[in-house]
């Protein structure tokens, strides 16, 4: 999987969208690793 900064951000945006935004506040692009996905 792509692990560039931009890929991580887009992937997280998709995850937040699917979860309705119900995730921890610190679940942000700069504070998650690729393992979070």
């Amino acid at each position: 999987a792509c692990d560039t900064a931009t890929c991580v951000t887009h992937r997280l945006a998709g995850l937040l969208s699917r979860s309705g935004g119900v995730v921890k506040n610190n679940f942000v692009p700069t504070n998650v690793g690729s393992k979070a996905f």
Partner: antibody, heavy 119, light 107 residues
Framework: EVQLVQSGAEVKKPGASVKVSCKAS????????MNWVRQAPGQRLEWMGV????????TYNRKFKGRVTITVDKSASTAYMELSSLRSEDTAVYYC????????????WGQGTTVTVSS | DIQMTQSPSSLSASVGDRVTITCKAS??????VAWYQQKPGKSPKALIY???YRYSGVPSRFSGSGSGTDFTLTISSLQPEDVATYHC?????????FGQGTKLEIK
């Protein structure tokens, strides 16, 4: 309102260094990566590097061979790009850019900073 | 580094025309491609991410498609305000790389 406001135009001599700033507002600065991209006259956009403002970790374009340094001042929500050993080919418009999810899912760019390298 | 080759370099079309710009990557970049619109003297503005997804606020006449090495930006009905240079970018690998740009003019 999300804003990335860059420092003003610079004129430098060959061999000198330049440091461009990018002040972010309207979002949590440390939550999102900050990229630096430049555009020389008549040339394609060129990605220079990215920084994680939360950790300070950077990734650079190898093309710049150690001439570029990206840093942040978290307390001032400001990113910096320093380019050393300037040559005429470094004459370009330099942009900061950050892809956000909140408050809006969008790829925001600064207004650009013109750097002219001339003897 | 991944080479992004855009074509054409420039094109002239009439208001209402369907316009297609293509971008070819030198290696497989999945769908990790973005498209930007840049008007003279302005910063690039993001249009498309992940090859085919429009950012909020981008008019529906803009669409993107493709995967692997071949990508397309289509403007379904050209408007006068679409006069600009369009850039593709791959962000699958570091360093991110851009196409050389396509300058779009109105006939």
């Amino acid at each position: 309102e999300v804003q990335l406001v860059q420092s003003g135009a610079e004129v430098k001599k060959p061999g000198a260094s330049v440091k461009v700033s990018c002040k972010a507002s309207g979002y949590t600065f440390t939550d999102y990566y900050m990229n630096w991209v430049r555009q020389a006259p008549g040339q394609r956009l060129e990605w220079m590097g990215v920084i994680n403002p939360y950790s300070g970790r950077t990734t650079y374009n190898r093309k710049f061979k150690g001439r570029v340094t990206i840093t942040v001042d978290k307390s001032a929500s400001t990113a910096y790009m320093e380019l050393s050993s300037l040559r005429s080919e470094d004459t370009a418009v330099y942009y900061c850019a950050s892809l956000l999810i909140r408050p809006h899912y969008f790829d925001y760019w600064g207004q650009g900073t013109t750097v002219t390298v001339s003897s | 580094d991944i080479q992004m080759t855009q074509s054409p370099s420039s094109l002239s079309a009439s208001v209402g025309d369907r316009v297609t710009i293509t971008c070819k990557a030198s290696q497989n970049v999945g769908t990790n491609v973005a498209w930007y619109q840049q008007k003279p003297g302005k910063s690039p503005k993001a249009l498309i991410y992940s090859a085919s997804y429009r950012y909020s606020g981008v008019p529906s006449r803009f669409s993107g498609s493709g995967s692997g090495t071949d990508f397309t930006l289509t403007i379904s009905s050209l408007q006068p305000e679409d006069v600009a240079t369009y850039h593709c970018q791959q962000y699958n690998f570091y360093p991110y790389t851009f196409g050389q740009g396509t300058k779009l003019e109105i006939k």
